[in-house]
Every structure is written in C-alpha cells, then in structure tokens.
C-alpha cells in the first residue's frame, strides 16, 4: 500500500499551514505519467490549455512540468514537531505562467493563467515513495488528492489511508 | 525535543538472528518516513532500509534482501530491524533516522546515537 | 543504482581557509542530494538537503552547489570544530551515500 497514515489525523493542519519562504527550495523538470505509464499531456485550445491523460505513440516526445518545491510548516500545536515539522509543497507549470489548479467545486484539475503569489488552489502536499513516485494533496482541500478519471485529470478524495494505494493518484517523475 | 533511541545490538554469532529496535519521540511518528543506516568499524555510512509512514512500501540494499525485514508499530512509534542469517560483513553501528519531512522519502533530518552490532563466532 | 564518489578522500587545511569538497553522481540526481557531517564518536547530522538548503541551526559558512551530476560543500572559513568526515548522499533513486571526505586541521 501506498500509504500515508491517518489522512483524517492531518488534514486540519494543510488549511493553516503556511509556505516558509517566497522562493522555492529547488526547482525540478521532469515529464509526468500515470502508475500505469500514460503520459500527462497538455495541449492548447481555442487559447486555454487542455488536460489529457494519453499513450504516447512510439518516439513522440513528452510533456515537461516544472515543478517547484516550497516548505511549509506545520502549525507547532497539530504536528507536535515544532521546528522539525515540515512538509514539502508543489507547484506544477507546464509552461510559462500557466499553473496546475484545483477546482474543488468542480473536482477538477485545471491550467490556469496567473502571476505570483500564487494562489492556494495551486499548492499541492508532496507525498512520495521516491522522488519518481508520487502524490500530490490539494492544500486547499485536505484528503483530496490529483487522480486520473476517464482519462483526465481528476480531484479523487481520499478517505482513509488505505485507500492511498489506488494507483488512479499515483505518479511517476521522470527526466526524459 | 526530538529523540531516538535505537536497542537491541550485541554481539551474536554468524547465522544468527537479532532484532533492533528504535523508539521514537518528540514528533509524529505516523507523518514521517523512517530508516535504518549502518556504518562498518572506521567505514562509511551504508543505507540499509526504509520504511514509509503506515509500513505498506518497505525498500532494502540488495545484500540484506530476504534476510533483514524493516517494520513498525506507530501505536508504539516504534520501528524494528528483524536481522536474520547473520553475516560478519554485517558488524556495524545501526543507525535509526527520521524523515526530513512529513509524508515524504526525502532526507533524513535527525539521527539515533546508533547501536552496535557484532556479528563473530 | 547510482554511485555517488566523493573526492578527496582526505583534506588537510589551516583555520580560516575556504574549503571545497566535491561529490559526482553516476547519473542526474536532479539536486536531489545532501550533505551530512558525523563527529568522531557521534552520529551523523544533516547540514545541507536539496543541494542548496542550510539546515536549521547550522552555521552559514557551510554552503552547498551543483547540479546534474557535480555537486559541492563549501566551508568559507574553516573553523576547528569543523574538524569531520562529510559525506553526500543522493535520494533522486533510491538511496546512496558516498564514501565520504575527511577534513582535517593542518
């Protein structure tokens, strides 16, 4: 099982935890794919982008995301860590100026145009097996995780720790 | 104040078993990551295993598969080291380690005082 | 996997001197690496994560660089209690420390 344990233990915490700097820590390229290899594509249409969730036909070349890692701190009474109570936040661009959001009325997964500070729609919790494996957790909507659903990308909410194996919000990172 | 406290080292002879234990404090235990290192007389540091936050995904260094198993007990925040068939090559200081963040793999932000294990007929 | 090689093995420097330790991946880590120090008789402690980030409470005269697969630890002004062996270790896949730099006073 892919796991984080008590989803629900944590989740009052990511509502008032707060970004420890304006910078991010590091900054990574890397394209994205689904557990079961789809690659995470994005097109643009009609001036928007677009989402898609694809097999990529031999030698076709993938999408990239930057990703930016952010710490953020726990607030001090929930995590019982103080100082050492960290976590590590996302954001993802595809391209310049364009940022993954939540829609959480819609639970959707959006590209939208925006300038910094970003705002919390576009923060995900990073919870990972390694560096190429990994889930991202709305910041605005603990227990909420991007999922895959009909070949798009998805809000899946996520209500016990259990249910964290599901491989529909599980993603690979890779460089190439 | 985070502390852990890793028991259980000794010496023991080849082909035995032993098993390690670290008991954690001063944080939440469940949130994080947990790992055991190991550092051979006047040698460097080896990763040994890891274990994420509710013990579904355990990772091992090849020369320990099928002979050490990683668990823990977040009831008890508490993580063992199950080492079985032991071999010479296995003498050394076994190190507990925590997660540098919640929820994530990476980094390991804060270190047992380690506890020694000889393996010797 | 990938190796991680730390050079030198040994570095021998007089207090206040700017000290360079270098450690090179067998393949991008994507600055996914840090750095740690162990004491004679101590565990090791964590001074530098993701490359670049300063661990809280560690002295700014250590300093970490790089990217792909060359990256380095600085100590602007050596000071006597920096007196350890250092050792890199890359998280980008899997889990890998490298053999470490011991630093010493001249």
């Known amino acids: 099982a892919f796991g984080i344990s008590g989803v629900q233990k944590y989740t009052r915490a990511l509502h008032d935890s707060s970004i420890t700097g304006i910078s991010p820590i590091t900054e990574y390229l890397a394209s994205l794919s689904t557990y079961n290899d789809q690659s995470i594509t994005f097109a643009l249409e009609d001036e928007s982008y677009e989402i898609y969730v694809e097999d990529l036909k031999k030698d076709e070349k993938k999408d990239k995301v930057l990703l930016s890692y952010y710490e953020s701190q726990h607030p001090s009474n929930e995590s019982g860590d103080g100082v050492d109570g960290k976590m590590l936040m996302v954001t993802l661009s595809p391209t310049k100026d364009f940022w993954l959001h939540a829609n959480n009325k819609e639970h959707s997964v959006e590209l939208h145009k925006c300038e910094k500070p970003l705002p919390d729609q576009a923060f995900f919790v990073l919870h990972n097996m390694h560096s190429n494996c990994v889930s991202f957790e709305c910041k605005t909507d603990p227990g909420v995780f991007i999922g895959v659903k009909d070949n798009h990308l998805a809000l899946i909410k996520v209500d016990s720790s259990e249910n964290l194996c599901t491989e529909n919000i599980l993603f690979k990172l890779s460089e190439t | 104040e985070v502390q852990l406290v890793e028991t259980g080292g000794g010496l023991v002879q080849p082909g035995r078993s032993l098993k390690l234990s670290c008991v954690a404090s001063g944080f939440t235990f469940s949130n994080y990551w947990m790992y055991w290192i190991r550092q051979a007389p006047g040698m460097g540091l080896e990763w040994v295993s890891s274990i994420n936050n509710d013990g579904g995904n355990t990772y091992y260094l090849d020369s320990v598969k099928g002979r050490f198993t990683i668990s823990r007990n977040n009831a008890e925040n508490t993580v063992y080291l199950q080492m079985n068939s032991l071999r010479s090559e296995d003498t050394a200081t076994y190190y507990c380690?925590?997660?540098?963040?919640?929820?994530?793999?990476?980094?390991?932000?804060?270190w047992g005082q380690g506890t020694l294990v000889t393996v010797s007929s | 996997d990938i190796q991680m090689t730390q050079s030198p093995s040994v570095l021998s420097a007089s207090v206040g001197d700017r000290v360079t330790l270098s450690c090179k991946a067998s393949?991008?880590?994507?600055?996914?690496l840090d750095w740690y120090q162990q004491k004679v008789g101590e565990a090791p402690k964590l001074l530098i994560y993701?490359?670049?980030n300063l661990q809280t409470g560690i002295p700014s005269r250590f300093s970490g660089s790089g990217s792909g697969t060359d990256y380095t630890l600085t100590i602007s002004s050596l000071q006597p209690e920096d007196v350890a062996t250092y050792f890199c270790f890359q998280y980008n896949s899997g889990w890998t420390f490298g053999q470490g730099t011991k630093v010493e006073i001249k």
């Open positions: 380690a925590k997660g540098h963040y919640s929820y994530s793999s990476y980094s390991f932000g804060y």
């Open positions: 993701f490359t670049n």
């Open positions: 393949h991008n880590i994507n600055k996914h």
